[in-house]
Interface confidence: low
């Protein structure tokens, strides 16, 4: 949608045109919730909030309103050369229903963060891929924006500054039109080892890789897959020690929480791969909130007491939608031994290539 | 693993107040909810109130409102509640208590017992 | 705050007999309900969340039933170790317990 800021002899100082996606966390009466919303296309510019600013004393703002009282602005300040949105904020009603449905609090919040929105004086902002603002409990993505402040003729100059996610890296090709080809592939993930204690010691020992395989439609129809890698270095792991289900908790970026729960076939002394649940958060998505759970699963096998290896890459297929690829799987649940693996038994992958 | 570690028992006078504590471990503390129930000796379980420590939202229980505070500090994972204006009716076993996603509370801690004697 | 007014207080019952709990609230809940388990000296321990969802590892014989205000939890054969206090937990409006039922072994 198109928002413009007029002064008062009606010339258009600010002009923005984007489409924008909020993930909000927010607490409900069963514990924390997350919220996708895209702004909707009722959103108006508040034209007395929203101002021209006046020289040397007080800087352009666009205030946009939607639903029951929330309110997105977006702050410019310039130097001699550059402009940029220097803050964003997002006033959110938690007694919105509608947005909020079970919100234990019915306080209106602020959130606010500083933004890598910036271009040349006299240039126009442009950015088609998505550009994410990140705020305490609130992430705001822009899509294929056009944002100008400081205009000089009530209209988007032909000049333009890309954000950086559109312009091609040194090994890349100019961006493609959206198509339902895959993503590029990503590096392998890094492999890092997790275990699950419990009152009796450990009742999990992994080391792995993990690459989630997504494949979601787009706001603009368009299919797309993709390939994520769970990054260790920002995932926190926990889990749980039963007697029948041992779970492991990967908490990772982008709210991101990916759940294995691994069972044991009492008659046949087996543990294996159960059950894989993802909840996680696609802002391009045109349902941002991706979820897939599969509890069926018959992977990585292997005796209980035995751990199961395998250095070939495995792909675990959870739904149409998600799989996982795991790579450099070492694993071994239920009874684990002084906290090491116990004897190998190598998947057939492994076995055929040797 | 998910872990909530609660502070030592407090023997206390009436009229005072009680504050005590609950570390959690295991997970990333500011996703969850951490609650307080409390169990008098032969009775029913009664919820006190909860915190979402990554906002610091707290709602209690009607009749707690007031006499009970819950804080967080996301520093050291530590929740707090604090409870004044003590009885012989608030002697009991309090326990905090960790939400698990949408399902109701499915991590206990392991309770710190209040006695509130003259 | 919603009321929960759950019955009997406490129940006698047979080995491989079915007992059901029941639970009423004071206004809809929507289906978040929860269950306890408590024996004597231990904290509580989750059964059943989400009115029918059983936590893993809780023996199958467990179940949870209801919609609205009416809820209630059946235990279809009743086991020695089944022996406890039971409690039920509304979730949908803040949080309340149930006053709880004891059961026994005749």
């Known amino acids: 949608a198109m928002f413009i800021v007029k002064n008062g002899n009606g010339t258009a100082c600010i002009m923005a045109n984007f489409s924008a996606a909020f993930s909000v966390n927010y607490d409900t009466k069963s514990g924390p919730k997350n919220m996708t919303f895209d702004l909707p296309s009722d959103a108006k510019v508040v034209l007395n909030s929203s101002s021209c600013g006046k020289e040397n004393t007080s800087d352009p703002s666009l205030v946009i309103a939607f639903g029951r009282g929330q309110t997105l602005t977006l702050n410019f300040t310039r130097n001699a050369t550059r402009y940029s949105v220097q803050l964003m904020s997002f006033v959110y009603n938690l007694s919105d229903t509608h947005l909020f449905p079970n919100a234990s609090s019915k306080e209106i919040k602020t959130v606010e963060s500083i933004t890598d929105i910036r271009a040349d004086i006299d240039k126009k902002y442009r950015c088609v891929s998505g550009t994410q603002v990140h705020m305490n409990n609130v992430t705001v993505t822009l899509h294929d924006a056009t944002i100008q402040a400081y205009l000089s003729n009530s209209s988007f100059s032909r000049e333009e500054t890309r954000c950086e996610q559109d312009r091609p890296s040194p090994t890349t090709a100019p961006p493609a039109p959206p198509s339902p080809s895959p993503s590029p592939v990503p590096e392998s993930p890094s492999v890092d080892k997790y275990n699950v204690s419990g009152t009796n010691g450990t009742c999990l020992l992994a080391s792995m890789g993990l690459q989630l395989n997504l494949t979601y439609e787009r706001k603009d129809n368009t299919t797309v897959t993709r390939l994520l890698n769970i990054n260790p270095n920002k995932t926190l792991a926990s889990g749980s020690c039963g007697a029948h289900l041992v779970t492991l908790e990967l908490h990772s970026e982008g709210s991101t929480v990916l759940l294995f729960q691994f069972g044991m076939n009492a008659s046949s002394s087996r543990f294996f791969l159960q059950g894989i649940q993802l909840n996680t958060t696609l802002p391009d998505a045109r349902d941002p909130a991706f979820k897939a759970a599969n509890s069926s699963l018959r992977a990585l096998q292997a005796t209980v007491g035995n751990s199961y290896k395998c250095n070939a890459e495995e792909h675990v297929r959870v739904t149409k939608a998600f799989s996982v690829n795991i790579f450099k799987v070492w694993v071994q649940a239920f009874k684990v031994e002084g906290g090491q693996f116990g004897s190998v038994e190598e998947c057939l992958l492994d076995e055929n290539n040797m | 693993q998910v872990q909530l570690v609660q502070s030592g028992a407090e023997l206390v006078k009436p009229g005072a107040s009680v504050k005590m504590s609950c570390k959690a471990s295991?997970?990333?503390?500011?996703?969850?909810?951490i609650h307080w129930v409390r169990q008098a000796p032969g009775q029913g379980l009664e919820w006190i109130g909860a915190?979402?420590?990554?906002?610091?939202?707290?709602p209690y229980a009607q009749k707690f409102q007031g006499r009970a505070t819950l804080t967080a500090d996301t520093s050291s994972s530590t929740t707090y509640m604090e409870l004044s204006s003590l009885t012989s009716e608030d002697t009991a076993v309090y326990y905090c208590?960790?939400?698990?996603?949408?399902?109701?509370?499915?991590?206990w801690g392991q309770g710190t017992l209040v006695t509130v004697s003259s | 705050d919603i009321q929960m007014t759950q019955s009997p207080s406490s129940l006698s019952a047979s080995v491989g007999g079915k007992v059901t709990i029941t639970c009423k609230a004071s206004q809809d809940i929507d289906r978040y309900m929860a269950w306890y388990q408590q024996k004597p000296g231990k904290g509580p321990k989750l059964l059943i969340h989400d009115t029918s969802t059983l936590q893993p590892g809780v023996p199958s014989r467990f179940s949870g039933s209801g919609s609205g205000r009416d809820y209630s939890l059946t235990i279809s054969s009743l086991e020695p170790e089944d022996i406890a206090t039971y409690y039920c937990l509304q979730y949908d409006n803040l949080w309340t317990f149930g006053g709880g039922t004891k059961l026994e072994i005749k």
């Open positions: 295991g997970y990333i503390f500011t996703n969850y909810n």
């Open positions: 915190i979402y420590p990554g906002n610091g939202d707290a």
């Open positions: 208590v960790r939400a698990n996603w949408d399902v109701a509370f499915a991590y």
